[in-house]
Amino acid sequence: KESCDVQLYIKRQSYHSIFAGDPFKLECPVKYCAHRPQVTWCKLNGTTCVKLEGRHTSWKQEKNLSFFILHFEPVLPSDNGSYRCSANFLSAIIESHSTTLYVTDVKSASERPSKDEMASR
């Protein structure tokens, strides 16, 4: 029978190259059965993952999957780094792989990098 464990589908070594000053949505795909778990985002600081408080988050529902979204409105240079989502399910904590944001500061860069340059990162 199908497993009813909560699963977080962030791919290992995933990353996003984004611009400061523009909005971005970081999605954590969540699979669950009956009750939606409590999900949080944290940002890695060395080996510690610091829980993000007072941030704009929301849920998006698709057919067989829900997405817990961390909103960046807009992205800031300090948002550069690695993030992890975690779910609290039946008193257990399930952690995702980390996903990394590479933030380009468009004010310090001479111009926005081209799509080719971004693809080569």
Epitope: F19, G21, G54, R55, H56, E73, L76, P77, V106, K107
Partner: antibody
Framework: QVQLKESGPGLVAPSQSLSITCTVS????????VHWVRQSPGKGLEWLGV???????SYNPAPMSRLSISKDNSKSQVFLKMNSLQTDDTAMYYC??????????????WGQGTSVTVSS | QIVLSQSPAILSASPGEKVTMTCRAS?????MHWYQQKPGSSPKPWIY???NLASGVPARFSGSGSGTSYSLTISRMEAEDAATYYC?????????FGGGTKLEIK
């Protein structure tokens, strides 16, 4: 230097639409966001929405269905369109530049505002 | 949406007096901005990100706070400080303003 200047119709009839143009100078719309904020005696300051540098928009969910923000980078202009105006949309409408520092975002330069009265 | 409640609504102070106004948020926010507005003018940035004074703001102004409680303080009131001060949060859409504190000179 950084400047933003709003131009609007002044008077709008109820149920009609409002169009305001914000013309900016001293910065590029591809690097900075431009926000729309209104101020009415009854509601105080209310953030309406923003045109982000990359061309995406974010809106205040309350008046969102009536709002549309667009821009023309080459003309350094940002446009606000609001449909189905009612008397409580009477306000001063400001366009405002948004800027980020390392770890925060704020609205720094404000236009002088354009007064909009909704009346028949 | 995050509601910002400013108190007091009206504040009267004598020159040289210490002034403190507060802004309380209905939910925790990362930081608070403050704007000053005088009659007939647009709002001006006054304090960024809780405690950073905007360019040209006198050093007698300061800001502090965290979570749901923030404040703006003037160490010694001067006549030119008479204005309405608005707090503003940029943590969650819609990005809201407080109702303002009108500061008057006695």
């Amino acid at each position: 230097q950084v400047q933003l200047k709003e131009s609007g119709p002044g008077l709008v009839a109820p149920s009609q639409s409002l169009s305001i143009t914000c013309t900016v100078s001293g910065f590029s719309l591809t690097t900075y966001g431009v926000h729309w904020v209104r101020q009415s005696p009854g509601k105080g300051l209310e953030w309406l929405g923003v045109m982000w540098p990359g061309g995406r928009t974010s809106y205040n969910p309350a008046p969102m269905s009536r709002l549309s923000i667009s821009k023309d980078n080459s003309k350094s202009q940002v446009f606000l369109k609001m449909n189905s105006l009612q008397t409580d949309d009477t306000a001063m409408y400001y366009c405002v530049r948004g800027d980020y520092e390392y770890d925060y975002y704020a609205m720094d330069y404000w236009g002088q505002g354009t007064s909009v009265t909704v009346s028949s | 949406q995050i509601v910002l409640s400013q108190s007091p609504a009206i504040l009267s102070a004598s020159p040289g007096e210490k002034v403190t106004m507060t802004c309380r948020a209905s939910s925790s926010v990362s930081y608070m901005h403050w704007y000053q507005q005088k009659p007939g003018s647009s709002p001006k940035p006054w304090i960024y990100a809780t405690s950073n004074l905007a360019s040209g703001v006198p050093a007698r102004f300061s800001g502090s706070g965290s979570g749901t409680s923030y404040s703006l303080t003037i160490s010694r009131m001067e006549a030119e400080d008479a204005a309405t001060y608005y707090c503003h949060q940029w943590s969650s859409n819609p990005y809201t303003f407080g109702g303002g504190t009108k500061l008057e000179i006695k």
